[in-house]
């Protein structure tokens, strides 16, 4: 029950996180005009990953897309890439995790397969969250650098008399949305990985051992006895789980918690 809850909660948290990453990526307010210690202007500038906008005091807002790829700063391109990778990985992770949910039955899918998928989606969510956090942090760092550069020459003298208003940009709402969303996706991923450990059947005391008698059908030796001698060159000692005796192939399909490190 706890495993199902952990997995379900991990899925929901990741879903919210990825929705937040998508929202942040699409938002226009990655950087907003700094209003502190600045002349109060009748226009408010803000910029996103895809376009820049100007809101006039009249209420009119005009947005212009960045219609160039080569002309954009490399850092902006990197942030775009990180956010898109985060979204793609998150979306795939969500798709995988839907099928991995313990509460959803799809055909005769084994718990081992579900555990596999849960872990896969968990890792995807973790990487997705890290991509988003990295993207937002790179952009924030870029803003901080530019902020202090523009503060250094906030008013550029022109002929000694005329002053030019230097527009400074500070953190926009999208950055905070991105950080929170990335964090949620990361937490969701960790929860999925924890749930995976609970889904994967644990190694316990063995009730039976199966081994191959050369060329013959599988033999079972009850009583927890572990055969140490073989009947032929292809004889293998196999561990049987508490769930009862199974064929060698079935047993092998269960991942152990040590399969993923």
């Amino acid at each position: 029950m706890a495993v199902t809850a952990c997995q379900g909660l991990g899925f929901v948290v990741s879903l919210i996180g990825i929705a937040g990453i998508i929202a942040a990526t699409c938002m226009d307010q990655w950087s907003t005009q700094d209003l502190y210690n600045n002349p109060v202007t009748a226009v408010f500038n803000y910029q996103g990953l895809w376009r820049s906008c100007v809101r006039e005091s009249s209420g009119f807002t005009e947005c212009r897309g960045y219609f160039t790829l080569l002309g954009l700063p490399a850092m902006l391109q990197a942030v775009r890439a990180l956010m898109i990778v985060g979204i793609v990985l998150g979306a795939i992770g969500l798709l995988v995790s839907i099928f991995a949910l313990k509460c959803i039955r799809i055909g005769s899918m084994e718990d081992s397969a579900k555990a596999n998928m849960t872990l896969t989606s968990g890792i995807m969510f973790i990487v997705s969250g890290l991509c988003a956090i990295a993207g937002v942090s790179v952009f924030a760092n870029m803003l901080v650098t530019n902020f202090w550069m523009s503060t250094a020459n906030m008013y550029t003298g022109m002929g000694g008399m005329v002053q030019t208003v230097q527009t400074r940009y500070t953190f926009g709402a999208a950055l905070f949305v991105g950080w929170v969303a990335g964090g949620l996706t990361l937490i969701g991923g960790v929860m999925m990985c924890i749930a995976c450990r609970g889904l994967a059947p644990e190694e316990t005391n063995y009730k039976a051992v199966s081994y191959h008698a050369s060329g013959h059908s599988v033999a079972y030796k009850p009583g927890g006895f572990k055969a140490s001698t073989g009947f032929g060159s292809n004889t293998k000692n196999k561990k049987i789980y508490d769930g009862g005796a199974r064929t060698e192939d079935e047993v092998q399909s269960y991942p152990s918690k040590h399969d993923y490190v």
Partner: antibody, heavy 117, light 113 residues
């Protein structure tokens, strides 16, 4: 069509509060901001302040402590209050609708206010 | 506050001739966000409210004759009337629409010679 009409008392005593109303039609105050401008006889234009679509305001720093702009969206009315008036506040008061570039594309005919005892 | 200055104070031009009015601001009116200059030109005829001619320094308001042209950037702006008509007799004002308070120029009185 778009119309703006200023109204209020034509005569105000010194030290009293001047109260003017701008009634608009043909557009909504939730979509357009309104600005107040005054013009003393034979002189230039002076911007007093503006009220934005959301109700936020900005005033001329020279009059900041005396001027107040508010509005009633449902009645399509914008109000200007100027306290502690003196003879220097005698002017024609206009309200205008803000448009692209924060320009005033439509103006009222203006109302003449005289400050005298 | 931004100080707006206009030159000349008054201008007398013959009908059909070109009229040029200059406006200078003490600070740049160019917004880096959209590379637009927040300067507006108004025309005011006696006994009438001002009429919008040009916004964003060079964008003509709809219904304004194309003989009116706005130009300039940063701190120096110009309103040009290519061929003066009798109905153009008025006072012309420039306005800073960028930094509060949104100050007006003192005006330029245009008359016919």
């Amino acid at each position: 069509q778009v119309q703006l009409q200023e109204s209020g008392p034509g005569l105000v005593k010194p030290s009293q509060t001047l109260s003017l109303t701008c009634t608009v039609s043909g557009f909504s105050l939730t979509s357009y901001a309104i600005s107040w401008v005054r013009q003393p006889a034979g002189k230039g234009l002076e911007w007093l302040g503006e009220i934005w679509t959301g109700g936020g305001t900005n005033y001329n720093s020279a009059l900041k402590s005396r001027v107040s702009i508010s509005k009633d969206n449902s009645k399509s009315q914008v109000f200007l209050k100027l306290s502690s008036v003196t003879a220097a506040d005698t002017a024609r008061y206009y309200c205008g609708r803000l448009s692209y570039g924060n320009s005033l594309d439509y103006w009222g005919q203006g109302t003449l206010v005289t400050v005298s005892s | 506050d931004i100080v707006m200055t206009q030159s000349p104070d008054s201008l007398t031009v013959s009908l059909g001739e070109r009229a040029t009015i200059n406006c200078k601001s003490s600070q740049s009116l160019l917004n880096s966000g959209n590379q637009k200059n927040y300067l507006t030109w108004y025309q005011q005829k006696p006994g009438q409210p001002p009429k919008l001619l040009i916004y964003w320094a060079s964008t003509r308001e709809s219904g304004v004759p194309d003989r009116f042209t706005g130009s300039g950037s940063g701190t120096d702006f110009t309103l040009t009337i290519s061929s003066l008509q009798a109905e153009d007799v008025a006072v012309y004002y420039c306005q800073n629409n960028f930094i509060y308070p949104l100050t007006f120029g003192p005006g330029t009185k245009l008359e016919i010679k």
